[in-house]
Amino acid sequence: FERTRSLQDPCSNCPAGTFCDNNRNQICSPCPPNSFSSAGGQRTCDICRQCKGVFRTRKECSSTSNAECDCTPGFHCLGAGCSMCEQDCKQGQELTKKGCKDCCFGTFNDQKRGICRPWTNCSLDGKSVLVNGTKERDVVCGPSPADLSPGASSVTPPAPAREPGHSPQ
């Protein structure tokens, strides 16, 4: 079948990086500069993406693959194939229409992107707050208040694992 198809359609023989040139008797011609074809049998080459402005080139365009962009420092990619760049904020902030703003009390963001999220409500799980939340960190929930009644053993965090060959300080 492949052989018959290629007899019927000479364009199917054109490999990636070329196009089937109707103006030249359907000869396979190389893609012109700043264009590419990622599959065989193409009748045209696609224009390469240009990474300009807030975008910068992560991978140059070749005759067989499109350029890939990322964002300049201080920005991060959004969308498929980095279709958008968005400004980074500091931890403890979120990006609004007026720039980076601190998280409101009771919310936190531990990344340079995304929105401020509410602290975990420990009481919903019948637990108590072991470590208070901040703008940058969620609260840490501990055992329920009942577990902390007199006589109950207190919660102690596990000792940090020591690396082999290091003596305790």
């Epitope: 402005g53 910068r56 300049t72 920005f75 279709s83 720039g99």
Partner: nanobody, 125 residues
């Protein structure tokens, strides 16, 4: 308080040149992107050029490529737009913008936080 002040607009003959300046105060200019936009009478806002620190090459609208050049002077906290071979269709109020929030590929998608008041460029014989 961030302030952007454009200057350098005026009346110029077709084929002539102008250099627009945008002085930024209260803004850490070097850490982000800045751009020039324009609004012709009765038209919407159009992206002209954007330049970013640490980025690739500046981005220009097709209508000004090869004629306009965007540049900046970090020491003076100033953005420039050199406009050559001016045409009647370049007549517009030109605005500078700073502190890019987010952007797609077309200049029209660039969302800036701060804007100047604008300077009028009239190209006429």
């Amino acid at each position: 308080q961030v302030q952007l002040q454009e200057s350098g607009g005026g009346l110029v003959q077709p084929g002539g040149s102008l250099r627009l300046s945008c002085a930024a105060s209260g803004y850490t200019y070097s850490s982000n992107c800045m751009g020039w936009f324009r609004q012709a009478p009765g038209k919407g806002l159009e992206g002209v050029a954007v330049i970013c620190t640490g980025g690739g090459s500046p981005s220009y609208a097709d209508s000004v490529k090869g004629r306009f050049t965007i540049s900046r002077d970090n020491a003076k906290n100033t953005l420039y737009l050199q406009m050559n071979s001016l045409r009647a269709e370049d007549t517009a109020v030109y605005y500078c913008a700073a502190d890019l929030l987010r952007a797609g590929t077309p200049l029209s998608s660039y969302e800036f936080n701060y804007w100047g008041q604008g300077t009028l460029v009239t190209v006429s014989s």
